[in-house]
């Protein structure tokens, strides 16, 4: 499956929007740094089948969408930027869904990748728990924004590697 050229442009736009969501100086938030235990092994494509990688990327973007579409995120972040961000993520999801259908077909079932998808879900559960514990403070959102920017960048790198393998 060939992801459209607009897909990588959308990735870049989403990253730019995340960067623009900064509300306070991050230097004041160093005390709130946290290890969310990003599931790095799910993004190391040593033995990744393409269909598995696409499923993991889809889950990553879906969970990012869920995280930023809560009422707490709307209260903490710029709504105009959030709306633009949702549009970009929605487009990413559509692109990846088309790919999943083509790649998975009848031979493989997405259930084969359940462990990988579960690892991504647990990662986002840790992020949500952190935000809850920190009472959705400005610094907590700043730490999460930085973390999502990093994980999003790693997702983009995986997509680039998949493309170069074609």
């Amino acid at each position: 499956c060939d992801l459209p050229q607009t897909h990588s442009l959308g990735n870049r736009r989403a990253l730019i929007l995340l960067a623009q969501m900064r509300r306070i100086s991050p230097f004041s938030c160093l005390k709130d740094r946290h290890d969310f235990e990003f599931p790095q092994e799910e993004f190391d494509d040593k033995q990744f089948q393409k269909a598995q990688a696409i499923s993991v990327l889809h889950e990553m973007i879906q969970q990012t969408f869920n995280l930023f579409s809560t009422k707490d995120s709307s209260a903490a972040l710029d709504e105009t930027l959030l709306d633009e961000f949702y549009i970009e993520l929605d487009q990413q999801l559509n692109d990846l869904e088309s790919c999943v259908m083509q790649e998975v077909g009848v031979i493989e079932s997405p259930l084969m990748y359940e462990d990988s998808i579960l690892a991504v879900r647990k990662y986002f559960q840790r992020i949500t728990l952190y935000l809850t514990e920190k009472k959705y403070s400005s610094c907590a959102w700043e730490v999460v924004r930085a973390e999502i920017m990093r994980s999003f960048s790693l997702s983009i790198n995986l997509q680039k590697r998949l493309k170069s393998k074609e």
Epitope: R22, P26, F27, L30, R33, E147, R150, S153
Partner: antibody, heavy 121, light 106 residues
Framework: EVQLVQSGAEVKKPGESLKISCKGS????????IGWVRQMPGKGLEWMGI????????AYSPSFQGQVTISADKSISTAYLQWSSLKASDTAMYYC??????????????WGQGTLVTVSS | DIQMTQSPSSLSASVGDRVTITCRAS?????LNWYQQKPGKAPKLLIY???SLQSGVPSRFSGSGSGTDFTLTISSLQPEDFATYYC?????????FGQGTKVEIK
């Protein structure tokens, strides 16, 4: 390969201005902060300040606030440390180092080779 | 500002010795880093987040501690370990370094 390459040694007179540089390569320059550290001859390490190259936000140590200016040009992946009026006491080795920002990762994991600044009349 | 106090300021040891350097923060912190510096060279990160070994650093180096008291241990000193060691708090700005511990050959 991640590298921070600093500009060469400088010999200046008191009262002169100076701008030294630190060029990052082998990684996404805007994804990491750049910190500056001073080491006076035979002395220990002193943290001067830090910059987020993505938007040029800065933080300074109170000891260096107003004495130096930290800046960055993300288009050429370079951070700068500058003085408008040097003093003899600014004679030191200056290091730049990479910091992961708010991410949970090693602090100051890569360092430049250092720039020796000598201020003498 | 958070003050970092290292001890001892210098020590003499032999190859094979177990060496311990301590670092005390003036307030409780959760992010403590250890660096090694050799003459004429840039500092090198050894330990981050108090106890995590930086990639490529020999396992004879270890870090421990929490709150205000931290330790760097070299389990069996090697000839290349003779250098100056610095602790640094990354908990809050302004970041601050300890004054350094020089490890010399006995």
């Amino acid at each position: 390969e991640v590298q921070l390459v600093q500009s060469g040694a400088e010999v200046k007179k008191p009262g002169e201005s100076l701008k030294i540089s630190c060029k990052g390569s082998g990684y996404s320059f805007t994804s990491y902060w750049i910190g500056w550290v001073r080491q006076m001859p035979g002395k220990g390490l002193e943290w001067m300040g830090i910059i987020d190259p993505s938007d040029s936000d800065t933080a300074y140590s109170p000891s260096f606030q107003g004495q130096v200016t930290i800046s960055a040009d993300k288009s050429i992946s370079t951070a700068y440390l500058q003085w408008s009026s040097l003093k003899a006491s600014d004679t030191a080795m200056y290091y730049c180092a990479r910091h992961p920002g708010l991410n949970w990762a090693p602090d100051f994991d890569y360092w430049g080779q250092g720039t020796l600044v000598t201020v003498s009349s | 500002d958070i003050q970092m106090t290292q001890s001892p300021s210098s020590l003499s040891a032999s190859v094979g010795d177990r060496v311990t350097i301590t670092c005390r923060a003036s307030q409780s912190i959760n992010n403590l880093n250890w660096y090694q510096q050799k003459p004429g060279k840039a500092p090198k990160l050894l330990i981050y987040w108090a106890s995590s070994l930086q990639s490529g650093v020999p396992s004879r180096f270890s870090g421990s501690g929490s709150g205000t008291d931290f330790t760097l241990t070299i389990s069996s000193l090697q000839p290349e370990d003779f250098a100056t060691y610095y602790c640094q708090q990354g908990y809050d700005t302004p970041f601050t370094f300890g004054q350094g511990t020089k490890v010399e050959i006995k």
